[in-house]
């Protein structure tokens, strides 16, 4: 059988909402990029905790092409994208893909290279100017001096494109100098410095709240006042008149 033509009324997979998994649920216009340090400064067991943190965060975001779009990239001396901002998949499937990010355990994880990748590949074209653009840089290591020559240039390039960079330093080997440089570039570039992956869970809600507060709410729907939004979930039809709030739960 041939595929049915896509008409304006066709429901894309990610438009079929999945119920929120937590009380806190970020419903804002946001493009969020997770950059995961794939160096051996994190053990494989610690990298599993890092992935758990990413998936935990994803559970607290209203992921869809209309609301929060996510990208997930593991970086070492190069970058490996697992999820792109335009990937049209169910949130549960995106979380499953994020859980399968492979541990590289490489000697080097180049923040310069991954920020360059973020600037020129992920945000090369701004296709959602109304959404906030945030990069969560999860870093546990220091790249060699020779690799960091253009670091500031890439951070400034991201600033020009209105991409907020939030560095999360993890453990004793995180590059504090680079973290401070990122912070200096823009007031929104708030850093979180943790002593180990064990602190990620403690900081998670603060980080999610911070990201969410940086993103705009959607403009009010242009439906006639007597109409409510209808959202379809797996096996459940719900009618909601809620406005899209940071913590609104559209079931």
């Amino acid at each position: 059988p041939t595929d049915a033509p896509v008409s304006p009324t066709t429901l894309y997979v990610e438009d079929i909402s999945e119920p929120p998994l937590h009380d806190f649920y970020c419903s804002r216009l946001l493009d969020l990029v997770f950059l995961l340090d794939g160096s051996s400064r994190l053990s494989e067991a610690e990298f599993e905790v890092l992935k758990a943190f990413v998936v935990d965060m994803m559970e607290r975001l209203r992921i869809s092409q209309k609301w929060v779009r996510v990208a997930v990239v593991e970086y070492h001396d190069g970058s490996h994208a697992y999820i792109g901002l335009k990937d049209r998949k169910r949130p549960s499937e995106l979380r499953r893909i994020a859980s399968q990010v492979k541990y590289a355990g490489s000697q080097v994880a180049s923040t310069s290279e991954v920020l360059k990748y973020t600037l020129f590949q992920i945000f090369s074209k701004i296709d959602r100017p109304e959404a906030s653009r945030i990069t969560l840089l999860l870093m546990a290591s220091q790249e060699p001096q020779r690799m960091s020559r253009n670091f500031v240039r890439y951070v400034q390039g991201l600033k020009k494109k209105k991409v907020i960079v939030i560095p999360v330093g993890i453990g004793p080997h995180a590059n504090l100098k680079q973290i401070r440089l990122i912070e200096k570039q823009a007031p929104e570039n708030k850093a979180f410095v943790l002593s180990s992956v064990d602190e990620l869970e403690q900081q998670r809600d603060e980080i999610v709240s911070y990201l969410c507060d940086l993103a705009p709410e959607a403009p009010p729907p242009t439906l006639p006042p007597d109409m409510a939004q209808v959202t379809v979930g797996p096996g459940l039809l719900g009618v909601s008149t809620l406005g899209p709030k940071r913590n609104s739960m559209v079931l």
Epitope: E44, E48, V49, K51, A52, S99, Q100, D198
Partner: nanobody, 125 residues
Framework: AVQLVESGGGLVQAGESLRLSCTSS????????TGWFRQAPGKEREFVAA????????YYADSVKGRFTISRDNAKDMVYLQMASLKPEDTAVYYC??????????????????WGQGTQVTVSS
């Protein structure tokens, strides 16, 4: 919280295989790292194998390396322990244990917060 239930134990001959299963009720199993431990009569409980919440990382006790395989299917909320080339010294009650994925996967039993009731495995010579 999560409740763990083991199944698949039984009586087998030396050299045969058995597959143990652990399922959870309560929160989805993908929220937990999972381990298998065993306790033979009159002995301390010992670590057998562990798997991280994503399935990306596994650990084995030296005594079972190459013979036992731990795996998981998060879509079905199941963790398995495939046991091959069984020996009489593998006779024990086998326990499934879990700890939250925000912690590192461990081999020590103190790291695990949730435990099943156990399933008996008997290997006769």
């Amino acid at each position: 919280a999560v409740q763990l239930v083991e199944s698949g134990g039984g009586l087998v001959q030396a050299g045969e295989s058995l597959r143990l299963s652990c399922t959870s009720s309560g929160r989805a199993f993908s929220y937990y790292n999972t381990g298998w431990f065993r306790q033979a009569p009159g002995k301390e409980r010992e670590f057998v194998a562990a798997i991280s919440w994503s399935g990306g990382l596994t650990y084995y006790a030296d005594s079972v390396k190459g013979r036992f395989t731990i795996s998981r299917d998060n879509a079905k909320d199941m963790v398995y322990l495939q046991m091959a080339s069984l020996k009489p010294e593998d006779t024990a009650v086998y326990y499934c244990a879990a700890n939250r994925r925000q912690k590192t996967v461990q081999m020590g039993e103190r790291a695990y917060d949730y435990w099943g009731q156990g399933t008996q495995v008997t290997v006769s010579s």
